[in-house]
Interface confidence: low
């Protein structure tokens, strides 16, 4: 009675099961009754990750420096090429096929967490006694000046996007 | 090759609202921001968002929050953009252009859809 | 929101000569990766708007090497070096770098 399913790393072919071709190899052609299942290393700048069936191994993927990309990890006979972008740009997709730049915090608003690879800026509104003058990617925002450490009165109060301004103590005379 | 297709021209009432389709293929879709832009008769463009189909994230051009409900579906490759309480000066072509990043441009374009607000 | 000024408002031009249209940002369109993300697109009549250039000087895929852009900060310009019929219809600038996206008012080229 020919088989109706095969053992792990096996498949039906011609009611016989052949023995699947390992990954980093494609398969050249099928077992026979006399003869093995032949397969064949994949050539340069292609992979195969499982343990397979098929005739053409995949390109690895093109880190386009078009669209902001570059090479985070080289791809082996196994394993694809990992895509991860450009200084200042984070990935669009968990795929990261494409780019986009890090959004910028604006003033009155400091970064909470810096943009990584794959993450976009997290931008914070500055709190009472703190403020960011600034449009950026990377200033936190900065305490209020103490003027009372630099013996100095408040002269103009601070806002989220605006240091105090200090001043001298009137002295009586 | 890429090719955005918009649903086709609307007439609509006062008040009511509409939704714009724009079915994108020859890319993968999740990868690539659908942006949608306004062109008033006779007038420029005019940048209404976009949505990162992929996480679903959306930015709006301030004039038109709340008014415009940007929504992607992966499933179908199609991105959608809807306006609410209708005005007639909401008569206008609405074009949905993909971002082609990096290029940080929007490379390619829908064939536009009239949307036209009448009593 | 950064304003985009486009002059001429209208274009008159002669097949095989020259043509230049201007276009100035209320700010600098200069990221700090040194990327200008000012881009040109032109909308024939009739038809969806397409790109022409993008990042100030990069020419998109298809478009002829007549078209060139120039610039930088705030002041750009878009080349024509030798208008041909098909070139008419309606230019815009349009920058990138700051949300919400803006665009020029357009500039009108026809032929004289």
């Known amino acids: 009675e020919p088989p109706t399913a095969c053992r792990e790393k096996q498949y039906l072919i011609n009611s016989q099961c052949c023995s699947l071709c390992q990954p980093g190899q494609k398969l050249v052609s099928d077992c026979t009754e006399f003869t093995e299942t032949e397969c064949l290393p994949c050539g340069e700048s292609e992979f195969l990750d499982t343990w397979n069936r098929e005739t053409h191994c995949h390109q690895h993927k093109y880190c386009d420096p078009n669209l902001g990309l570059r090479v985070q990890q080289k791809g082996t006979s196994e394993t694809d090429t990992i895509c991860t972008c450009e200084e200042g740009w984070h990935c669009t997709s968990e795929a990261c096929e494409s780019c986009v730049l890090h959004r910028s915090c604006s003033p009155g608003f400091g970064v909470k967490q810096i943009a990584t690879g794959v993450s976009d800026t997290i931008c914070e509104p500055c709190p009472v006694g703190f403020f960011s003058n600034v449009s950026s990617a990377f200033e936190k925002c900065h305490p209020w000046t103490s003027c009372e450490t630099k013996d100095l009165v408040v002269q103009q109060a601070g806002t989220n996007k605006t240091d105090v301004v200090c001043g001298p103590q009137d002295r009586l005379r | 090759q890429v090719q955005l297709v918009q649903s086709g021209a609307e007439v609509k009432k006062p008040g009511s609202s509409v939704k714009v389709s724009c079915k994108a293929s020859?890319?993968?879709?999740?990868?690539?921001?659908m942006n949608w832009v306004r062109q008033a008769p006779g007038q420029g463009l005019e940048w209404m968002g976009n949505?990162?189909?992929?996480?679903?994230?959306?930015n709006y051009n301030q004039k038109f929050k709340g008014k415009t409900t940007l929504t992607a579906d992966k499933s179908t490759s199609t991105a959608y953009m809807e306006l609410s309480s209708l005005r007639s000066d909401d008569t206008a072509v609405y074009y949905c252009?993909?971002?082609?990043?990096?290029?940080?441009?929007?490379?390619?374009w829908g064939q536009g859809t009239l949307v036209t607000v009448s009593s | 929101d950064i304003v985009m000024t486009q002059t001429p408002l209208s274009l008159p031009v002669t097949p095989g000569e020259p043509a230049s249209i201007s276009c100035r940002s209320s700010?600098?369109?200069?990221?700090?990766?040194?990327?200008?993300?000012l881009h040109w697109y032109l909308q024939k009549p009739g038809q969806s708007p397409q790109l022409l250039i993008y990042?100030?000087?990069n020419r998109f895929f298809g478009v002829p090497d007549r078209f060139s852009g120039s610039g930088s900060g705030t002041d750009f310009t878009l080349k024509i070096s030798r208008v041909e019929a098909e070139d008419v219809g309606v230019y815009y600038c349009?920058?990138?770098?700051?949300?919400?996206?803006?665009f020029g008012g357009g500039t009108k080229v026809e032929i004289k």
């Open positions: 252009a993909r971002l082609g990043l990096q290029l940080y441009a929007l490379d390619y």
């Open positions: 020859g890319y993968t879709f999740t990868g690539y921001n």
């Open positions: 949505i990162d189909p992929y996480y679903g994230n959306t």
């Open positions: 700010q600098s369109l200069v990221h700090s990766n040194a990327n200008t993300y």
């Open positions: 990042k100030l000087t």
């Open positions: 349009s920058q990138s770098i700051h949300v919400p996206w803006t």
